[in-house]
């Protein structure tokens, strides 16, 4: 806390300049009034304070609107804005989108923050929706913002959001998020025709379920092994020893190299050994010939 | 318009002293923060010191400290720079620029120092 | 003291895009937003190119754009012209002196 000390003759703040980096901590508390801040705060940023004297000019809107600061503050933060506590941006109504991206812009090439990821629940939580221009705007400032959302949150992306999304912002998602924004994809981009719906398509599959997987065989995808990777386990291991060969197309010869790791390991044990040797490629794992499939799971099912 | 015009050229002998001016047009002087920075010949920029003319007091660079002495005239928008003790590796050009984040500049003053 | 680094020399053909760094610690470059660019050509005054780390002036052309990443700046230059061929410097406010630090220089070279 600063002392309440009387403003120097001749040192009373007219306006916000520079001349205020040659201020001690007590004289900014004393010689520059809140309001004026308040209405020049687009100016604080191209003045080099230091962080203890940003504490000072923090202290001084903090007196002045105990409430919560007004939109018009908020958006010339700047700077500043690095001194906010998450308990201080639950007070702000954030509406503007441009309001957002000047605060996101601060922490640009930084981690997102404790006050960054409370900034963004405050600002979505108003909209009461993730819209498309805010999605765009989060994605941008960081790319795996949608992966770091729970799948409840994910829920309220309306589909045509997803066309903001680029393959680089689910690289962090896990399956149980896939599985919520696969169906928004597969609505959002169902009227494109075949190879330009797999193209967008793609990047959401990991939620896709095994009769979706089965038609895109049908379709000459060509679907990549990092791709095939990612699919969910549960819905691979109903596909033929055909379908996948479909899928992936010139991209079979990859199973080879990933017949230990799931889901291809799991698949090769669901199918006939000579099935799996009409790919030519050494498949081993396979139910042997001449065996007898339970599907013990079905059994379960009908008791 | 934003105008720094600064003084003409000079030659000096080392061990003297040089005083150049900039003079500010079209905006406010007083309480803007005007640098001197200073390119040797073929070198990078060198930052020298600084005024904010209604203060008067002025801050230096820790290798001119003692050396330059920075003014300013608020009645006339004039920033001065002295350089004293002049030596041969003093030879620059000699640039005043307004604002911490230098958006104006002057046009530069050559200060040849030879014996 | 502070100190900025910056590459000697960088070079580009006519349409491309360069990106010059500008290195210093987290007390300056990483710790503030107040690292700026400026433009010098061969017998002229330095001009301000970027502020605030990626601010415009105004009459600064869209082609130039600021960033940083944890202790470096970077100035992109796209569609790359030849009046661009200049010396770039990185400079930030140094609060210790209370005064200004510049980088070494990046000479661009347009092929």
């Known amino acids: 806390e600063v002392e309440k000390t009387a403003c120097p003759s001749g040192k009373k703040a007219r306006e916000i300049d520079e001349s205020l980096i040659f201020y001690k901590k007590w004289e900014l508390e004393a010689c520059v009034d809140a309001a004026l801040l308040a209405t020049q705060m687009d100016r604080v940023n191209a003045i080099p304070f230091t962080y203890e004297q940003l504490d000072v000019l923090k202290h001084k809107l903090d007196e002045l609107y105990p409430q919560g600061y007004p939109e018009s503050v908020i958006q010339h933060l700047g700077y500043l804005f690095l001194k906010m506590s998450p308990e201080d941006i639950r007070k702000w109504n954030v509406t503007s989108l441009e309001t957002l991206k000047a605060l996101l812009e601060v922490n640009k090439g930084h981690e997102m923050s404790p006050q960054v990821a409370t900034l963004i629940d405050r600002f979505v939580k108003g909209r009461g929706q993730l819209d498309k221009d805010t999605l765009d705007t989060l994605t941008a400032f960081y790319p795996g913002y949608l992966c770091s959302l729970s799948p409840e949150e994910l829920s309220s992306v309306p589909p045509s959001s997803i066309w903001a999304v680029r393959p680089q912002d689910l690289d962090t998602c896990d399956p149980r998020q896939l599985d919520v924004l696969y169906p928004k994809a597969r609505l959002a981009f169902q009227n494109m025709n075949g190879s330009e719906y797999f193209v967008k398509i793609q990047s959401f599959l990991g939620g896709a379920p095994t009769e979706d997987l089965k038609a895109l065989s049908q379709q000459n995808v060509s679907m990549d092994l990092a791709t095939f990777m990612k699919l969910r386990t549960d819905a691979v291991l109903p596909l033929t020893v055909a379908e996948v060969q479909k899928l992936l197309g010139p991209h079979v010869e990859g199973l080879k190299a990933e017949e230990r790791h799931r889901p291809v390991r799991d698949w090769i044990l669901r199918q006939r050994q000579d099935d799996l040797d009409t790919l030519g490629l050494g498949l081993q794992g396979g139910i042997p010939n001449g065996y007898l499939v339970l599907d013990l799971s079905m059994q379960e099912a009908l008791s | 318009q934003v105008q720094l015009v600064q003084s003409g050229a000079e030659v000096k002998k080392p061990g003297s002293s040089v005083k150049v001016s900039c003079k500010a047009s079209?905006?406010?002087?007083?309480?803007?923060?005007f640098s001197w920075v200073r390119q040797a010949p073929g070198q990078g920029l060198e930052w020298m010191g600084g005024?904010?003319?209604?203060?008067?007091?002025?801050n230096y660079a820790q290798k001119f400290q003692g050396r330059v002495t920075i003014t300013a005239d608020e009645s006339t928008s004039t920033a001065y720079m002295e350089l004293s003790s002049l030596r041969s590796e003093d030879t620059a050009v000699y640039y005043c620029?307004?604002?911490?984040?230098?958006?104006?500049w002057g046009q530069g003053t050559l200060v040849t120092v030879s014996s | 003291d502070i100190a900025l680094t910056q590459p000697a020399s960088v070079s580009g053909s006519p349409g491309q895009s360069i990106t010059i760094s500008c290195t210093g610690t987290s007390s300056d470059v990483g710790g503030y937003n107040y690292v700026s660019w400026y433009q010098q050509h061969p017998g002229k005054a330095p001009k301000l190119m970027i502020y605030?780390?990626?601010k415009r002036p105004s009459g600064v052309s869209n082609r130039f754009s600021g960033s940083k990443s944890g202790n470096t700046a970077s100035l992109t230059i796209s569609g790359l012209q030849a009046e661009d061929e200049a010396d770039y410097y990185c400079?930030?406010?140094?609060?210790?002196?209370?005064?200004?630090?510049f980088g070494g220089g990046t000479k661009l070279t347009v092929l």
């Open positions: 605030s780390v990626s």
């Open positions: 400079a930030t406010w140094d609060h210790s002196q209370m005064g200004k630090v």
């Open positions: 620029a307004r604002r911490t984040s230098m958006d104006y």
């Open positions: 079209g905006g406010t002087f007083s309480s803007y923060y």
């Open positions: 005024i904010i003319p209604k203060f008067g007091s002025a």
